[in-house]
Interface confidence: low
């Protein structure tokens, strides 16, 4: 028999399971074709859908909430006590590994240190569903300047500034080898951007060149980075340089897969018991499963990748535990 439980009050926007260890789930999970409540009450009394199958929001036979196939091996199920709504931490699950998230523009940024000319760099960013970075605010530029783009243990010397291709070009408008000109956005689709200041200087140039490419130089000596020290250079587009890509934020699951709009997923981060819906590139309506303490183990560590799985650290204990609850099917 099921243990008595206190009177259940789910938050608005949540569905109350009739019984079982999971109590509250996000409302959109009701009648979505996947049973989430243990008693499957979220899929009961649903309106009939014409046609052979229910709409599954484009999902395959694998339930992205748990990453398991329906009717899969029950030993992979982890028992949970309660699924509670949580406020999702802003920095988790919005950018793939290696990309840095900035809330101000809902974008992800990544520096590529492989030297490429401007056009190859632009193509590389495009292949990654992004473009060479442009900036819409001073704050966005400051965020980029403040990042540690390579291995944190590396000690930076004075010359370890980053020279990065970014998404602007300098068009020469003056005649007779005058360097007067203007910055333009190099690629269409960059809306509401600010244009850089005049390039501090341009290196010796060929007489035929009338378009140069933007190189943002960030000085990465720790005491100087806090001064936002940087400079803008108009360089030959054929010079090889590191480059800065920018892409829209996106939902990223715990296995570093990009998740499409409307799908359920466990966000990248430090809580494998979190389940969310991807909406506008952000995890929304998240619920966190709470696990029972593993029996017969004093000291334990949670498995960072699997929900309700523990490593027992007791000298005489079994090493691996699943947290079993009495209501498990």
């Amino acid at each position: 028999t099921e243990p008595l439980r206190p009177e259940l009050r789910c938050n608005p926007g949540q569905f109350a399971c009739r019984s079982g260890t999971i109590q509250c789930i996000p409302l959109p999970w009701q009648c979505d074709g996947w049973a989430t409540c243990e008693d499957e009450s979220d899929e009961a009394n649903c309106p009939e859908v014409t046609g052979e199958v229910r709409p599954h929001h484009g999902k395959e036979a694998v339930d992205p909430r748990q990453g398991r196939a329906r009717g899969g091996d029950p030993s992979h199920f982890h028992a949970v006590n309660v699924a509670q709504p949580v406020r999702f931490s802003s920095f988790l699950g919005k950018c793939p590994t290696g990309w840095h998230h900035y809330e101000g523009t809902a974008s992800c940024y990544r520096v590529y240190l492989s030297g490429e000319n401007y056009w190859d760099a632009a193509q590389t960013c495009q292949r990654l569903n992004g473009s060479l970075a442009t900036f819409s605010t001073d704050q966005e530029l400051r965020f980029v300047l403040a990042q540690e783009w390579d291995q944190p243990e590396r000690s930076f010397g004075w010359k370890d500034q980053r020279k990065l291709w970014v998404g602007y070009q300098y068009v020469i408008t003056g005649r007779n080898r005058s360097l007067e000109g203007r910055w333009e956005v190099a690629f269409k689709g960059s809306s509401e951007v600010f244009l850089p200041p005049d390039p501090i200087f341009a290196s010796a140039m060929s007489e035929n060149d009338n378009v140069f490419c933007a190189q943002l130089q960030c000085f990465h000596f720790p005491t100087l980075r806090h001064h936002d020290l940087h400079s803008w250079h108009a360089e030959s587009c054929y010079e090889k340089s590191s480059f800065l890509c920018k892409r829209s934020q996106t939902c990223v699951d715990i296995k570093d897969n990009v998740v499409d709009e409307g799908f359920y997923f466990t966000p990248k981060g430090d809580d494998p018991c979190l389940s969310c819906t991807c909406h506008g590139g952000e995890p929304e309506m998240c619920v966190a499963a709470l696990c029972e303490r593993p029996q017969g183990c004093q000291q334990y560590r949670k498995d960072p990748k699997e929900c309700c799985k523990f490593m027992c650290l007791d000298p005489d204990g079994n090493s691996l535990f699943d947290s079993m609850a009495s209501g498990m099917r």
Epitope: G157, K159, D198, I200, F201, L224, D228, L229
Partner: antibody, heavy 115, light 106 residues
Amino acid sequence: EVQLVESGGGLVQPGGSLRLSCAASGFTVSSNYMSWVRQAPGKGLEWVSVIYSGGSTYYADSVKGRFTISRDNAKNSLYLQMNSLRAEDTAVYYCARGWTTFDYWGQGTLVTVSS
Amino acid sequence: QAVLTQPPSLSVSPRQTVTITCSGDQLGDRYVSWYQQKPGQSPMLVIYQDDRRPSGVPERFSGSNSGNTATLTIGGTQAMDQADYYCQTWDNSPVVFGGGTKLTVL
């Protein structure tokens, strides 16, 4: 064409004040690092102060607390307010664009501090 | 604060190559710029970031920087190159100039 023109130099007594101006054309002062560099008669170059595009200001130890760098974006001009002047501040003062390197310089204005 | 040391004066015959040195502790870890200043004129940038030449500066000017020494080399020196030359770098001070080298073209 980029041009920097300094003015405001002259003879001043020790302890006195002077305000130097630097009118820029061909580029936007507020978008660039702008510095003052001085050169005492027959001596080498000495960096004095910088103002960043973001507005942060830095000074050489020798002038800290006495000199103030500023700019007027509407006039596209740079200024150096010099107070509590000393004999050792006597120099030609140049305004220059840049900070880690100076790619354009004005013609300079002579400041003489003497009683 | 960095201290940059230059030879006070050097002489060179026309069409010869001359090298002006600038030394400082671990200077090779920092970028160095070089300026030319003729009598009664403002300084002019001739080399930046160790070895890069701004547009308009003749190809006979070149630079390098490693270890504790940066060098400015003028190949095929001309009478018009007679001037004072200053090296410059930056650190937390933040800007430092060398004492200058008076180059005389004999």
